[in-house]
């Protein structure tokens, strides 16, 4: 008893210190180790009846989703599958954990985002982070070095995520990747495209794509004089500028990453610039940025990119931004991103973002870090943040008032009688067989109000009544629930009607 | 019954380097922090490192920081540390200790130590 | 780091004497303090932990309070084991300090 009466008071005062560290804004890992030394902590403890009431509540930065919500996200996935289709890929799968050494090495700093699963009798397991690691070991295993793919599935982060603005620890990605060897920047071109296409399809408000390229980011640290080791870092600290000011980011890279203030201030002078394909022309003739082997290569192909982009009417939503350097380590070329835009306060003002909806990129040396003689296939994809759009488009039905359906149903099978539940079995029986989705209540006598008014709740738009004088005379009434407009079709004629009257194909084919 | 019984200590010169051991039974030793506790002859305790279970996070004394290594091994239920660039005043028995509820900067088991001297 | 500091640095006491142990902290460390007791040529043994829990084993005349920077070891009635060198601990951050030691000797 005095044991439990020390962990509790142990759990307690680990809890003020997690607090209190967060309250300091100590670093990551020292708040991340105190977390973790709490939940070891409480684990000892384990469960006590007397005093624990167990909350019924889904895990931090998971969520349910409602009938209404599926309803957005199928129309969500709707879109993008038919965009995704039309561009002519094929769709995989693959296993929602990998080994742990698959994942290892790939992500950088996030690695310490990737959930690690408890060990299960020999293999270290971890839940998958994206969609791309697991894909480029498809690649590599199976030596395939051609595929165009899209894969939709759940992907895992051990993220302190803010679900308000639709981030969470479990959330879905919709990838599509075009591996293999092609000529320079054509498939990078058709990514951007089917970007815009999601974005404009979706109708979620007006969105802009930031592009940038890898190698011009490093070609910049290198003639900015920041060393090799502290590329990646520094580059994280650049990724920030779409959410902080130039003299934060300046800070962090001066004050807790040890860059010298005269290399931070070269950087801004960089970092700080975005615009069309006339900032490439002009960054081909900086006498410093040119002379960079890894940068010219870079602006070289981002004005072919420009040039496809234009053939492809999108070049007016697209920015070249300097600041973009997406934090994934895999990048090794063009990199984008989009973010949709609010609408600005005043006329003259530049438009502000609100957050990233779609990403993507270049990585040519993914698959050859899985092949065991580093044979590279070149990749280019693109990732659509579907779950900040599902919070959007809910957000916008919601203000709206728009009502959702949330089942298909073309025909409720309905008796004004008593004494019919047999004929609307059979009924409605015929019409499942003949493809039609079709409904009835599960009484043995409904009154005909209660199934009219279920009707009206479900958005169904057709009744078929049933009566003991139709039945007698070979018809089905068939009442439309929105005009009430009531109509007698032959029995033989029903499906038909039916089909006709919901816009559905006359065959099941 | 818990156990820690260290090894590896000796005389050297400075500058060299040495390997302590720690061997641990008597309980889960991949459930527990551990850490390296020294004390200078007739003086007080010094707090010199500490490894995480998994070995996730280690921490050094400003002192030793650069010089020595923690580390550990789960399968062999043996936490070591490896000084390097050792100077007069790493002179002390260095005693192997076990966090108190497996992660509270408190030894609540000790080892019986081992004496490092290092002098020419 | 935070300093520990004890007081007294020795005391002389006879058995079957209350005798108060104090150690104050640099800056407030809530309840993180331990108290340890050694004998000579022995490994430190653990006496109170989170300024006033026991340690399983420890017999009840050992005693701790306080929170903050100001902490207290009682023996309430002293036995001839009891003689040794006392140390407080932090274990509030890192570096884990301790305390310069209380020797109790007999009188």
């Known amino acids: 008893m005095a044991e439990r009466a020390a962990l509790e008071e142990l759990v307690k005062l680990q809890g003020e210190r997690v607090r209190g560290l967060k309250q300091q804004k100590a670093s990551a890992e020292l708040i991340e180790e105190e977390v973790a030394k709490l939940l070891k902590l409480k684990a000892q403890l384990g469960p006590d009846e007397s005093k624990q009431k167990f909350v019924l509540k889904t895990p931090k930065g998971t969520r349910d989703y409602s009938p209404r919500q599926m309803a957005v996200r199928e129309k969500v996935f709707d879109v993008i599958i038919r965009c995704f289709k039309r561009h002519g890929a094929e769709v995989i799968d693959t296993p929602v954990f990998e080994l742990k050494e698959t994942l290892m090495g790939k992500y950088g700093e996030d690695s310490k985002l990737i959930y690690d699963l408890k060990d299960q009798g020999g293999e270290l397991l971890s839940l998958r982070y994206d969609l791309t690691v697991p894909f480029a070991r498809y690649l590599a295993m199976n030596k395939l070095t051609n595929i165009k793919r899209y894969h939709i599935a759940k992907v895992y982060r051990r993220d302190n995520p803010a679900m308000t603005r639709g981030r969470y620890r479990e959330f879905y990605q919709c990838d599509f990747d075009i591996a293999g060897n092609f000529d320079p920047m054509i498939p990078d071109a058709e990514c951007l495209k089917i970007m815009c296409e999601i974005l404009s399809s979706l109708q979620i408000g007006d969105f802009l794509v930031k592009v940038n390229d890898r190698r011009i980011l490093d070609g910049m640290f290198a003639i900015c004089g920041v060393s090799d080791s502290k590329f990646r870092t520094i580059c994280s600290s650049v990724d920030k500028l779409d959410k902080v000011s130039w003299e934060e980011v300046k800070n962090e890279m001066v004050g807790e990453k040890g860059l010298a203030p005269e290399v931070a201030d070269r950087i801004g002078d960089y970092v700080q610039q975005h615009g069309g394909v006339s900032l490439v022309e002009q960054l081909l003739q900086d006498p410093k940025l040119s002379q960079n082997k890894q940068a010219l290569e870079g602006l070289g192909d981002l004005k072919l990119l420009f040039e496809y982009l234009t053939l492809f009417g999108i070049d007016d939503k697209i920015s070249f931004d300097l600041s973009l350097a997406r934090g994934l380590d895999y990048y090794t070329g063009v990199i984008y991103e989009a973010v949709l835009l609010q609408t600005p306060a005043q006329a003259g003002e530049e438009p502000l973002g609100v957050g990233s909806v779609a990403a993507g990129g270049r990585y040519d040396g993914l698959v050859g870090m899985f092949d065991p003689k580093g044979r590279k296939v070149p990749c280019v994809g693109l990732s659509i943040g579907v779950e900040r759009i599902f919070s959007i488009v809910e957000q916008r039905l919601e203000a709206l008032e728009e009502k959702i359906r949330t089942t298909e149903t073309q025909v409720l099978v309905a008796s004004a009688q008593k004494k019919l539940l047999e004929e609307r079995l059979k009924l409605v029986s015929e019409l499942w067989d003949a493809g039609i989705k079709a409904e009835l209540l599960y009484k043995k006598n409904p009154k005909l109000l209660n199934q009219l008014q279920y009707c009206e709740e479900a958005g169904i738009p057709l009744v078929a009544i049933i009566g003991e004088q139709e039945l007698k005379d070979g018809v089905i009434k068939l009442r439309s629930v929105t005009s009430r407009e009531e109509v007698d079709v032959r029995r033989e004629d029903l499906v038909e009607e039916i089909k006709r009257r919901t816009g559905q194909p006359l065959c099941i084919c | 019954q818990v156990q820690l019984v260290e090894s590896g200590g000796g005389l050297v010169k400075p500058g060299g380097s040495l390997r302590l051991s720690c061997a641990a039974s008597g309980f889960t030793f991949s459930d527990y922090y551990m850490s390296w506790i020294r004390q200078a002859p007739g003086k007080g305790l010094e707090w010199v490192s500490y490894i995480s279970d998994k070995s996730r996070y280690t921490k050094y004394t400003p002192s030793v920081r650069g010089r020595f290594t923690i580390s550990r091994d789960n399968a062999k239920n043996s936490l070591y540390l490896q000084m390097n660039s050792l100077r007069a005043e790493d002179t002390a028995v260095y005693y192997c200790a076990r966090y108190l509820y497996q992660v509270i900067a408190i030894a609540d088991a000790w080892g019986q130590g081992t004496l490092v001297t290092v002098s020419s | 780091d935070i300093q520990m500091t004890q007081s007294p640095s020795s005391v002389s006491a006879s058995v079957g004497d209350r005798v108060t142990i104090t150690c104050r902290a640099s800056?407030?460390?809530?309840?993180?303090l331990a108290w340890f007791q050694q004998k000579p040529g022995k490994a430190p043994k653990l006496l109170i932990f989170?300024?006033?829990n026991l340690e399983s084993g420890v017999p009840s005349r050992f005693s701790g309070s306080g929170s903050g920077t100001d902490f207290t070891l009682t023996i309430s009635s002293l036995q001839p084991e009891d003689f040794a060198t006392y140390y407080c601990?932090?274990?509030?951050?890192?570096?884990?300090?301790f305390g310069q030691g209380t020797k109790l000797e007999i009188k």
């Open positions: 989170v300024a006033s």
């Open positions: 601990q932090q274990a509030e951050s890192f570096p884990y300090t």
């Open positions: 800056q407030g460390i809530s309840s993180w």
